[in-house]
């Protein structure tokens, strides 16, 4: 049935970038400016997305594909297809309801987005801290204290409070 219908339906011949114009005896008309059809057989063309304000154009609209937006510097995309732009924070911060806040002691964020996460607890893996953690960087774990040769030393920072309900490793 589907095959029979498509053979009889003149609109099925209209390729992407056109629409089946009911006002013109169902002939295939090109999509008007600022509109597109990404598949064949369409009876209308969709309006192109416009990247305004904090959005900027990543890919221009064409007759067969919608425009694609990203965010201006200082913001990053949220949601499928960059439906929203969200403020960047600095490394060592996380975006809260009250704006960008520094990571609490014992946590870090090495990206301009995302949340602060706890430092790796080297001792839970039988290792020692080679490089202290900061707000921007996780600690670096080294060999276990027993593996250190005489005279070698490892940095031992104050241990962060253990996170409730879960354990970093």
């Amino acid at each position: 049935f589907e095959r029979t219908r498509s053979l009889q339906d003149p609109c099925s011949n209209c390729p992407a970038g056109t629409f089946c114009d009911n006002n013109r005896n169902q002939i295939c008309s090109p999509c008007p400016p600022n509109s597109f059809s990404s598949a064949g057989g369409q009876r209308t063309c969709d309006i192109c997305r416009q990247c305004k304000g904090v959005f900027r154009t990543r890919k221009e609209c064409s007759s067969t594909s919608n425009a694609e937006c990203d965010c201006t510097p200082g913001f990053h995309c949220l949601g499928a297809g960059c439906s929203m732009c969200e403020q960047d924070c600095k490394q060592g911060q996380e975006l809260t309801k009250k704006g960008c806040k520094d990571c609490c002691f014992g946590t870090f964020n090495d990206q301009k987005r995302g949340i602060c996460r706890p430092w790796t607890n080297c001792s839970l893996d039988g290792k020692s801290v080679l490089v202290n953690g900061t707000k921007e960087r996780d600690v670096v774990c080294g060999p276990s204290p027993a593996d250190l040769s005489p005279g070698a030393s490892s940095v031992t920072p104050p241990a962060p409070a253990r996170e409730p309900g879960h354990s970093p490793q």
């Epitope: 949220l78 969200e86 996380e94 975006l95 809260t96 309801k97 946590t107 987005r113 995302g114 949340i115 602060c116 996460r117 706890p118 430092w119 790796t120 996780d138 774990c141 996170e163 409730p164 309900g165 879960h166 970093p168 490793q169």
Partner: antibody
Amino acid sequence: QVQLVQSGGDLVQPGGSLRLSCAASGFLFSNSWMTWVRQAPGKGLEWLANIKPDGSGQYYVDSLRGRFTISRDNAKNSLYLQMNSLRVEDTAMYYCARDRGNDGLDYWGQGTLVTVSS
Amino acid sequence: SYELTQPPSVSVSPGQTARITCSGEKLDDKYTFWYQQRTGQTPVLVIYQDKKRPSGIPERFSGSNSGNTATLTISGTQAVDEADYYCQTYDSGAPVFGGGTKLTVL
């Protein structure tokens, strides 16, 4: 489009081991925090573990420490959960998910069933 | 450890408004997320950052967060909305889930 395809679920005897896999595509896996969540039959969601983008740090729920190990291979765009000393109460559907922090767990695998029974 | 509490079940008639609550200490200091899980299916994020909707989620889903309680509101509830709903937040960088609420559309 983003896809997380899971495998490795099976029927295993108590005390046995299993390794779950999660193959990622459609996003920059090597820049993403990843997590494992499980759901026992008729129960709610339980967070198990997450792992840093470079794999250098892992975080676990206290009750599983020492038995389960989360790991990743960024060259293969894959996430793993090694489960040892399995118990009957570990029977559950196990899900991998991308953990976007303030954007939530925005994409989930289809789940893989682990049954621990003698 | 941080805990989120949800009612086990909520019932609503088709076309009516369903409200599912999630409570936790100083929850409005944190962002809350909501997931829908239909029977036999994988969880789907329906609300993030308290009130934002991911692309593809119907407008009838909305969220709020005030005091110790976050609320998922489904306006004009439809039969397809019958599912389990879970709230989630982060505590020290780790996801924490509520126990889940079964929404029944009568």
